[in-house]
């Protein structure tokens, strides 16, 4: 027999959690005239949903409650003066990782 | 030294994958006259993103490539016909689970 209370607890614990998302480094760093290799990296970002939120609010959202910066070594390619050749350099880029997530009320509709 | 090709492969493999999502059973089954306990269940659905899609298209989306139906035992509460009170019964509900996911082109803009 299934423990229905356990199912409810499972939903609460695992529906809104840090997950793998690929982010475009160029977009993340707003560095439009630089190409990075790889162009995307895996980061942990809050994901999933709060479909059955325990808060008393109209709309619940899954947000980070603990954020850290992590450094990733990537190859950076930038145009030189002219039409041929690129500056190539290894560089460390800092990207936000979400370590913990929470279901919270969107806006100020009580909680 | 970081293997940059390995990072690219990691992004490809893990950015668009089956993840835990909580779904409202009533909404999923379109059964507005019935209350289920628990109201939500965890299912595997394709999530993440395709930020650095390998396809030649303007917009790439993360979609299921293998879908299965799984049965979940829940408590179902329905109004009795013509009298006060609720029918209580344990029932199996079938929910879609995504087992494999793929990044594909949205619309028909090449591949």
């Amino acid at each position: 027999v299934v423990d229905l209370n356990l199912l409810t607890e499972e939903v609460r614990l695992y529906s809104c959690t840090p997950r793998n998302f690929s982010v475009s480094i160029r977009e993340e760093l707003k560095r439009t005239d630089t190409i990075f290799w790889p162009g995307c990296l895996l980061v942990k970002r809050c994901g999933g949903n709060c479909a059955c939120c325990l808060h008393n609010c109209n709309e619940c959202q899954c947000v980070p409650s603990k954020v850290t910066k992590k450094y990733h070594e990537v190859l950076q390619l930038r145009p030189k003066t002219g039409v041929r050749g690129l500056h190539k350099s290894l560089t460390d880029v800092a990207l936000e990782h979400h370590e913990e997530c929470d279901c919270v009320c969107r806006g100020s509709t009580g909680g | 030294v970081v293997d940059l090709n390995l990072l690219t492969e990691e992004v490809r493999l893990y950015s668009c994958t089956p993840r835990n999502f909580s779904v409202s059973i009533r909404e999923e089954l379109k059964r507005t006259d019935t209350i289920f306990w628990p109201g939500c269940l965890l299912v595997k659905r394709c999530g993440g993103n395709c930020a650095c899609c390998l396809h030649n298209c303007n917009e790439c989306q993360c979609v299921p490539s293998k879908v299965t139906k799984k049965y979940h035992e829940v408590l179902q509460l329905r109004p009795k016909t013509g009298v006060r009170g609720l029918h209580k019964s344990l029932t199996d509900v079938a929910l879609e689970h995504h087992e494999e996911c793929d990044c594909v082109c949205r619309g028909s803009t090449g591949g």
Epitope: P79, K80, R84 | -
Partner: antibody, heavy 119, light 112 residues
Framework: EVQLLESGGGLVQPGGSLRLSCAAS????????MSWVRQTPGKGLEWVAT????????YYPDSMKGRFTISRDNAKNTLYLQMNSLRAEDTAVYYC????????????WGQGTLLTVSS | DVVMTQSPLSLPVTLGQPASISCRSS???????????LEWYLQKPGQSPRLLIY???NRFSGVPDRFSGSGSGTDFTLKISRVEAEDVGVYYC?????????FGQGTKLEIK
């Protein structure tokens, strides 16, 4: 399939202005540098301008600096060439060309659009 | 500016025979990154130019292996081992190592 389609050419009087467009499809436009190259009966092929992936890097030959401006709209997958103070010697077929990923060569060219500067 | 001089300007060739086009630069065309950015483009009648060879000797994808590039310093050559009817057009060399980048004046290949 990579496609580059130029438009906006036509007849302009000396001293006039014109904007050429190049619509790109079949590739991730924002990940490529782009260039304009023109072809005149007298001078043959001549490089006109180059722009980086995001638009903040631009480069021109001295002879066209100040008169010509290259720009791009990555949301619209379109490259532009704004030409001011046009002269008879600017009469040419204007091609847009894609820079290879590592800026090693022009790997794809459009079909060209003809600009005629004449009174 | 670096001047690129091609010869001959006109090249009549018999089908199936080899052809050779020379391109000389007014100064050495080695980029600051050590690469020689010398390219060859073919413009067929009524079409836009298309890439044949890049960085002196690298064939672009889809280009038949009868086309080959060679050279260094200031002297470069494009060779066609056996000319076919579809090879007709104007061949241009191009240097991108120095600014501004410049094209040769073109060599018109025609069938005898």
């Amino acid at each position: 399939e990579v496609q580059l389609l130029e438009s906006g050419g036509g007849l302009v009087q000396p001293g006039g202005s014109l904007r050429l467009s190049c619509a790109a499809s079949g590739f991730t436009f924002s990940s490529y540098g782009m260039s304009w190259v023109r072809q005149t009966p007298g001078k043959g092929l001549e490089w006109v301008a180059t722009i980086g992936y995001g638009g903040s890097f631009t480069y021109y030959p001295d002879s066209m600096k100040g008169r010509f401006t290259i720009s791009r709209d990555n949301a619209k997958n379109t490259l532009y060439l704004q030409m001011n103070s046009l002269r008879a010697e600017d009469t040419a077929v204007y091609y847009c060309a894609r820079q290879a990923p590592l800026w090693d060569y022009f790997d794809y060219w459009g079909q060209g659009t003809l600009l005629t500067v004449s009174s | 500016d670096v001047v690129m001089t091609q010869s001959p300007l006109s090249l009549p060739v018999t089908l199936g025979q080899p052809a050779s086009i020379s391109c000389r630069s007014s100064q050495t065309i080695v980029h600051s990154d050590g690469t020689t950015y010398l390219e060859w483009y073919l413009q067929k009648p009524g079409q836009s130019p298309r890439l044949l060879i890049y960085k002196v000797s690298n064939r672009f994808s889809g280009v038949p292996d009868r086309f080959s590039g060679s050279g260094s310093g200031t002297d470069f050559t494009l060779k066609i081992s056996r000319v076919e009817a579809e090879d007709v057009g104007v061949y241009y060399c191009f240097q991108g190592s120095h600014v501004p980048p410049t094209f040769g004046q073109g060599t018109k290949l025609e069938i005898k």
